[in-house]
Amino acid sequence: MALPTARPLLGSCGTPALGSLLFLLFSLGWVQPSRTLAGETGQEAAPLDGVLANPPNISSLSPRQLLGFPCAEVSGLSTERVRELAVALAQKNVKLSTEQLRCLAHRLSEPPEDLDALPLDLLLFLNPDAFSGPQACTRFFSRITKANVDLLPRGAPERQRLLPAALACWGVRGSLLSEADVRALGGLACDLPGRFVAESAEVLLPRLVSCPGPLDQDQQEAARAALQGGGPPYGPPSTWSVSTMDALRGLLPVLGQPIIRSIPQGIVAAWRQRSSRDPSWRQPERTILRPRFRREVEKTACPSGKKAREIDESLIFYKKWELEACVDAALLATQMDRVNAIPFTYEQLDVLKHKLDELYPQGYPESVIQHLGYLFLKMSPEDIRKWNVTSLETLKALLEVNKGHEMSPQVATLIDRFVKGRGQLDKDTLDTLTAFYPGYLCSLSPEELSSVPPSSIWAVRPQDLDTCDPRQLDVLYPKARLAFQNMNGSEYFVKIQSFLGGAPTEDLKALSQQNVSMDLATFMKLRTDAVLPLTVAEVQKLLGPHVEGLKAEERHRPVRDWILRQRQDDLDTLGLGLQGGIPNGYLVLDLSMQEALSGTPCLLGPGPVLTVLALLLASTLA
C-alpha cells in the first residue's frame, strides 16, 4: 500500500514525503498500515511535524493511536519531537516492538537528560557509551535493571555491548561478584559468562535459576561444576531436599547424570510426585522466541543425539517440539508405565497425548489405557468414548489419578463405558467405585439403580448413601432387605440402617419391637408417610434413649408432621415437652383427600364436633 502524500505546510520542518499524522495515529502495524481517516474523508493529511507543532499535540493522543507508528514516520521528525513522542509513549505505557524501539533510539542521537521519562525498554537500544561518567552510567544502568533485557536476543549487538559497560559502571573487576552486583545487573546477570558462574556461584546460581532463556554451553558447564562441587548455596547433592529441588527448578536442565545419581532417591521420587501431581508446581514451559517458519522446520527434524532411546527423566528437559520430533509414538506406547514417574509439564503431556492419538486414531488399546496415569487428565470424554475398558484393574488405575477430586466428566464417561461393557453394576465394580466416590451410588437415577443386583448391596457402606434422595432409597431398600434377609436381628439392623429411608411403615413397626435404638440421624431420613402412622409407644421403642432428640428436632420433618398426628396426652408421657399434638376432646377424621391436599390431618374442634361428641357420649352411656 502506497504512503499517502501530503502537501507541505508553512512552518513545517519536515518534508512532504513524511506522510500524514493520521497515518501515524491509526496505522496498526509495520507491514499493513490501516486506511487513514484522510483517505476516508477525502481530506488531505498534514505532515506529522506540522501537526505536532499545533494542538492536538502528541501527549493528547490515546495509546491506541500511538500504537503502531512506522519508522518512516519518525525519521523526518526533529530530535525534540522524537523525544516528545518517546515521553508520550512512556506516559501512556504503550508496548512497542523491537523495531520501533530501535528506530526511536536511533533518532535520539544525543543522550537524553530525563531518562526516567522515557520508555524503560527504549534504554536497551541506547548506546551505553553515551553515559560514560560515574553518575550518568549509574543512572542509566539503574534504569536498565528494570527493563526487559529479553526483548533483545542474546546475540544482538545492543545486548552484547550492555554487559561489559554495566560491569565497568558498577566497578566490577575480575569475576568475583557480590550479591549487590548481581542485583544491580538485573536481567543482564543472565548473560554473565561461565567464569563468573565458577567464581561467584553462591550469589549467581540463585539468579540463574530464574533466567528465562536457556543458558549457553559455557554457563551450563560452569553451573554443573559448581553444583557438583557441593558449595553454597545448595550444598552437596547428597544432602538436597525437595525444597532444594524446587529452588533449583530453572537449573534442572543442566544437571548431569552424576548429579542426579547423587541426590537421595527418595527426594527425587518425592519431588517428582509433587511436581507431577500438583498443577501449581508445573512450570509453564519456557519457549525461546524464534521466527515461526524456523520453528516449523525444526519441529520436523530431531537434533542429533537427542533421539529418545527410552522414556526417562531426561525428557523433561526437552522442549515441546523436541518431544514431538524425538520421541517415537510406538516407544511411548510400550513404555507408558514410565511416564507417570516423570514430572512432565502439562504442555509436554499434550505433546505425548498427540503422539498417542496419531498412533491410535480409533482409540487406545487397554494395555496403554491402564498405564496412562496423569495423562488420563488430558483425555476428553470424546477420547474416552472410543475406549473399550474391561479390566477392573484399569478402572482402578485411572480412578487413582483423579482421587480426592470431584467426579470429572472424563471419570463419569469412563465409568459409564465400563459399566455398560459389563452389563450390570456388579459387587466388585460397586466396591471400587464407592471406594473412590462415596457418593457414586446416589448419582445414579432410580432407573439405573434398578439394575444393581441385590448381591452388590453388600459392598455399600453407610456413607455411600449420604446423598441419596427418597426415590433412590425406595429402589435400594427392597434390594438391601433381600440381601440381608438371612442375618440375625442385631446384625440385620446394623446393615439395613442406612437404607431405611426407603422402608414402609410395617417394617418400622417390626423394628420397634426389636430393641434396636435407631439413632436420630436415621430417623430423620425416614419417609414421612412411613413415620406418620407410628404410635408414640412405637417411636419410643424404636428410638430407645435417642427419643430424647425429638424435642430438638420437633420443627423438622418427619418429627413435626408426626407430632401433629399424635394425641398431646400420649406425647406428654415421653416427658420431653413436645408440643403440637391433638388436644384432648378433638376427633381426628382421616379424610385422605383432605390430607393429600394439605399434608395434615383434618381436626374437628369443639364447636363443629359437639354434635358428634354428644352422639358418641349418648351411645356410650346407653
Epitope: N515, S517, L520, A521, G544, P545, G549, G575, G577
Partner: antibody, heavy 123, light 107 residues
Framework: EVKLVESGGGLVQPGGSLSLSCAAS????????MSWVRQPPGRALEWLGF??????????EYSASVKGRFTISRDYSQSILYLHMNALRAEDSATYSC??????????????WGTGTTVTVSS | DIVMTQSQKFMSTSVGDRVSVTCKAS??????VAWYQQKPGLSPKVLIH???YRFSGVPDRFTGSGSGTDFTLSISNVQSEDLAKYFC?????????FGAGTKLELK
C-alpha cells in the same frame, strides 16, 4: 470457660440422707440436660439419671438402681444442680460427678464433667 | 441392664505403636457406643460416637469399629499424650452404662 463443680460429699450412716450440689458456669444452664454419674472405688462409672432442660419442662429420668431413693432437681436461677439421696446404703459409696448431657448432630454424649465429690456410707 | 466389659484393665505400649482397646456388650447395642478418654486429674473427653465416628478435633489416629456386641478403639502411632484411661459407653437402652476402663501405660 464451661465448668462444673460438685460439693456436699462426706461421711453418712446407712439409712441416712445427703444432698449434693453442682455449680455450673460458662453456659446457659437451663438449655441443657444435666446428669449425675458415680464411680465406686475400682468399678465402672454408673449413670444415675438426668434432668431435662427448660424446653422439655425439666422432667427427669432415673436408673432403676436409684429410682425412688434419689431425686434430681435444679435451681435454674442459681445454675445449680442437686442430687438428693435418701435411704443410703454402703454400696452407694462412690465419687459422684455431675455431667452435661449434650445433643448435637443427632447424637447424645457427656461433653462436660465435674471433678467429683466423695460420698462414704458407713457406720 | 446392659453390662459393658473392658477385659483389660491395663495395656502397655510404646510411642509409635498401634494399640487396640476392646469393649464387649452383654447384649446387642447396634452401633450405639461412645468412647471417652480420661487423663489423670482431668475430666473425661469424648472421642468417638456411633461406634466409629470421630468427634471433630479428635486426631485421625483414633479409630472406632464394631457393632452389635463387640467394639474396638484403635490408636495408631501412639503419642505420649495418648497415655490415659479409655472407657466405652452404650446408649442403646436405659440405663446408660459404661465400661470400667482400660488404662494405657508406657512399657
Amino acid at each position: 470457660e464451661v465448668k462444673l463443680v460438685e460439693s456436699g460429699g462426706g461421711l453418712v450412716q446407712p439409712g441416712g440422707s445427703l444432698s449434693l450440689s453442682c455449680a455450673a458456669s460458662g453456659f446457659t444452664f437451663t438449655d441443657y440436660y444435666m446428669s449425675w454419674v458415680r464411680q465406686p472405688p475400682g468399678r465402672a462409672l454408673e449413670w444415675l439419671g438426668f434432668i431435662r432442660g427448660k424446653a422439655n419442662g425439666y422432667t427427669t429420668e432415673y436408673s432403676a438402681s436409684v429410682k425412688g431413693r434419689f431425686t434430681i432437681s435444679r435451681d435454674y436461677s442459681q445454675s445449680i444442680l442437686y442430687l438428693h439421696m435418701n435411704a443410703l446404703r454402703a454400696e452407694d459409696s462412690a465419687t459422684y460427678s455431675c455431667a452435661r448431657y449434650y445433643y448435637s448432630n443427632y447424637v447424645w454424649y457427656f461433653d462436660v464433667w465435674g471433678t467429683g465429690t466423695t460420698v462414704t456410707v458407713s457406720s | 441392664d446392659i453390662v459393658m466389659t473392658q477385659s483389660q484393665k491395663f495395656m502397655s505400649t510404646s510411642v509409635g505403636d498401634r494399640v487396640s482397646v476392646t469393649c464387649k456388650a452383654s447384649q446387642n447395642v447396634g452401633t450405639n457406643v461412645a468412647w471417652y478418654q480420661q487423663k489423670p486429674g482431668l475430666s473425661p473427653k469424648v472421642l468417638i460416637h456411633s461406634a466409629s465416628y470421630r468427634f471433630s478435633g479428635v486426631p485421625d489416629r483414633f479409630t472406632g469399629s464394631g457393632s452389635g456386641t463387640d467394639f474396638t478403639l484403635s490408636i495408631s502411632n501412639v503419642q505420649s499424650e495418648d497415655l490415659a484411661k479409655y472407657f466405652c459407653q452404650q446408649y442403646n437402652s436405659y440405663p446408660l452404662t459404661f465400661g470400667a476402663g482400660t488404662k494405657l501405660e508406657l512399657k
